[in-house]
């Protein structure tokens, strides 16, 4: 009986249901290719349950396998624009700690104006994910066009 | 002991594992940009466990954070065709209740013939999701080319 | 009390958390359109927890609904290259047992160099998933550009 009670009182976070969905806040200064993210109910439909934002970058709080997903749409873009400004590339990776730095997901826009993808990857507490956009086209800040999220899947 | 038994007898639905994967049924009449979906084992590999269809639109039955995903492929399409027709755009949003109406996910085809994306978003019981396809090219009804689904992730 | 202990000692696998993320090993011989995958911590960030590899193809070990996802990037590719070598198509399907053979997910590259998508689908123990790439362009073996995975979602 005591187990049943304990079970019911455990916070969701202890079940490992860490999840976050972020919207674009701003791009970095001139030499910084990183996208800076924001999240929280006051901003609309973005949220952080477990992970945290550290200067606009997503920091993981729980070890496990995560589904990482992203969509980035270039602003004021057509296939002509995209091909004239080629190459525009988006890379998602672990940027800190430096010892774990690695690119997890990479896509080029070519003649398109949107990239969207997802993958499963092991992440550890303290890993910070960075999303680097190289190229000369601005990303859209519309919340239905550009977003980035993670979902804890299993230990 | 009674708790153990109760636990084992709980239907899956009570665990919050709501999930649906739908296939395209048909497009709307002239002024209606919505895609109409269908699902069920008799139709192939589509299914609804929890959510329901309301006149071809997906209605949510359980509050929570969901992973929403979609792929739409244009029929008889090439990059030339795509560029020679009016911009084709796909938007997934909450269309009812009207008070919660919002676009969740938006993509343009540009010179491509397929869009695919996914995102995490909070949905509430009674939310109806609509998928609006604007443009003059027909979506493929092949079940491996066009599909739409949701998966409950956490409360 | 005994139930509580039993619960805590159940291996993760018994909860149905089967998951796999694979990286490209090699393409098939001349008449074989299949991609051959590999996975395991020694190879980087790929892994198999539940499913297994059978001659480079992914075999399912647990019945259930799965989220299947894939990204394939063509090597040494530009939108010009892609359109000159069209059509390049990627199809993910059940290839054995033959009685369950079906295409689950299909995308063409058109003028792009990357495809990425995901879908929910019921899979049964013993189902083997094949990923067929038709066309004359080689897929990239970079682990952040080409990957394939499945995640058990519910029974």
């Amino acid at each position: 009986q005591r187990f049943a009670q304990a079970q019911q009182q455990l916070p969701l976070e202890s079940l490992g249901w860490d999840v976050a969905e972020l919207q674009l806040n701003h791009t970095g200064p001139q030499q910084d290719p990183r996208l800076y993210w924001q999240g929280g109910p006051a901003l609309g439909r973005s949220f952080l349950h477990g992970p945290e934002l550290d200067k606009g970058q997503l920091r993981i709080h729980r070890d496990g396998i995560y589904m990482v997903h992203i969509q980035v749409t270039l602003a004021i873009c057509s296939s002509t624009t995209a091909s004239r400004h080629h190459p525009t590339t988006l890379a998602v990776g672990i940027c800190s700690p430096a010892s774990r730095s690695i690119s997890l997901l990479r896509l080029s826009f070519h003649q398109g104006c949107t990239i969207a993808s997802q993958r499963l990857t092991p992440l550890a507490r303290g890993d910070t994910l960075c999303t680097n956009l190289t190229g000369t086209l601005l990303p859209s800040r519309n919340t239905d066009e550009t977003f980035f999220g993670v979902q804890w899947v299993r230990p | 002991q009674r708790f153990a038994q109760a636990q084992q007898q709980l239907p899956l639905e009570s665990l919050g594992w709501d999930v649906a994967e739908l296939q395209l049924n048909h497009t709307g009449p002239q002024q209606d940009p919505r895609l109409y979906w269908q699902g069920g084992p008799a139709l192939g590999r589509s299914f609804l466990h929890g959510p329901e269809l309301d006149k071809g639109q997906l209605r949510i039955h359980r509050d929570g954070i969901y992973m929403v995903h979609i792929q739409v492929t244009l029929a008889i399409c090439s990059s030339t065709t795509a560029s020679r027709h009016h911009p084709t755009t796909l938007a997934v949003g909450i269309c009812s209740p009207a008070s919660r109406s919002i676009s969740l996910l938006r993509l343009s085809f540009h010179q491509g013939c397929t869009i695919a994306s996914q995102r995490l978003t909070p949905l509430a019981r009674g939310d109806t999701l609509c998928t609006n396809l604007t443009g003059t090219l027909l979506p493929s009804r092949n079940t491996d080319e066009t599909f739409f689904g949701v998966q409950w992730v956490r409360p | 009390q005994r139930f509580a202990q039993a619960q805590q000692q159940l291996p993760l696998e018994s909860l149905g958390w089967d998951v796999a993320e694979l990286q490209l090993n090699h393409t098939g011989p001349q008449q074989d359109p299949r991609l051959y995958w590999q996975g395991g911590p020694a190879l980087g960030r790929s892994f198999l927890h539940g499913p297994e590899l059978d001659k480079g193809q992914l075999r399912i070990h647990r019945d259930g609904i799965y989220m299947v996802h894939i990204q394939v990037t063509l090597a040494i590719c530009s939108s010009t290259t892609a359109s000159r070598h069209h059509p390049t198509t990627l199809a993910v399907g059940i290839c054995s047992p033959a009685s369950r053979s079906i295409s689950l997910l299909r995308l063409s590259f058109h003028q792009g160099c990357t495809i990425a998508s995901q879908r929910l689908t019921p899979l049964a123990r013993g189902d083997t998933l094949c990923t067929n790439l038709t066309g004359t362009l080689l897929p990239s073996r970079n682990t952040d550009e080409t990957f394939f995975g499945v995640q058990w979602v519910r029974p």
Partner: antibody, heavy 119, light 111 residues
Framework: QVQMQQSGAELVKPGASVMMSCKAS????????IHWIKQTPGQGLEWIGD????????SYNQKFRDRATLTADRSSSTAYLQLSSLTSEDSAIYYC????????????WGQGTLVTVSA | DIVMSQSPASLAVSLGQRATISCRAS??????????MHWYQQKPGQPPKLLIY???NLESGVPARFSGSGSGTNFTLNIHPVEEEDAATYYC?????????FGGGTKLEIK
Amino acid sequence: QVQMQQSGAELVKPGASVMMSCKASGYTFTTYNIHWIKQTPGQGLEWIGDIYPGNGDASYNQKFRDRATLTADRSSSTAYLQLSSLTSEDSAIYYCATFSRFDGWFAYWGQGTLVTVSA
Amino acid sequence: DIVMSQSPASLAVSLGQRATISCRASRSVSTSGYSYMHWYQQKPGQPPKLLIYLASNLESGVPARFSGSGSGTNFTLNIHPVEEEDAATYYCQHSRELPYTFGGGTKLEIK
């Protein structure tokens, strides 16, 4: 409502050119492709080609490619068909047409332009 | 090019009876879950009028006595019951690929 108003009948000499117009109204001109169809008693209905007014991209039936030119003027919501090096075989009714939602079938037609090629 | 063969070239049907017009494509016009076959009615001095699109869909405003069926290469337009105003020439057209092509037409006369 959608309307397609075509220019009047033309009597032209062999070897000359003719340009006919199709003014569209009742919808956003740049949204829908405009198709041109030729009708003769002998050959029936033949698809000449179509143009996407949004960017001027045109596609042609190989049979007409060398002598037909499709253009569109967005400012006046008008599409044009020019035929060159005319012969008696080009004597026909020429229709412009567009669609209601998806491309491939024609819900709205102009009244037709009769072209007579005669010395 | 896909060749469309219509039959018969002409037919006479009594008022209230069924008229059946066939159209055969030289290769399949069905793909991606659709049959790209459409039917038109044309009366003298008028442009063609769309009746049926994608093999079986009735265009808005067209009476329900018109129906279409078929897939692959063989398609049928049915009119039942035939009315006086249905006297016209009927054409099939495919849009499976460019160039679009039309059938030679079937002239329907009401007896």
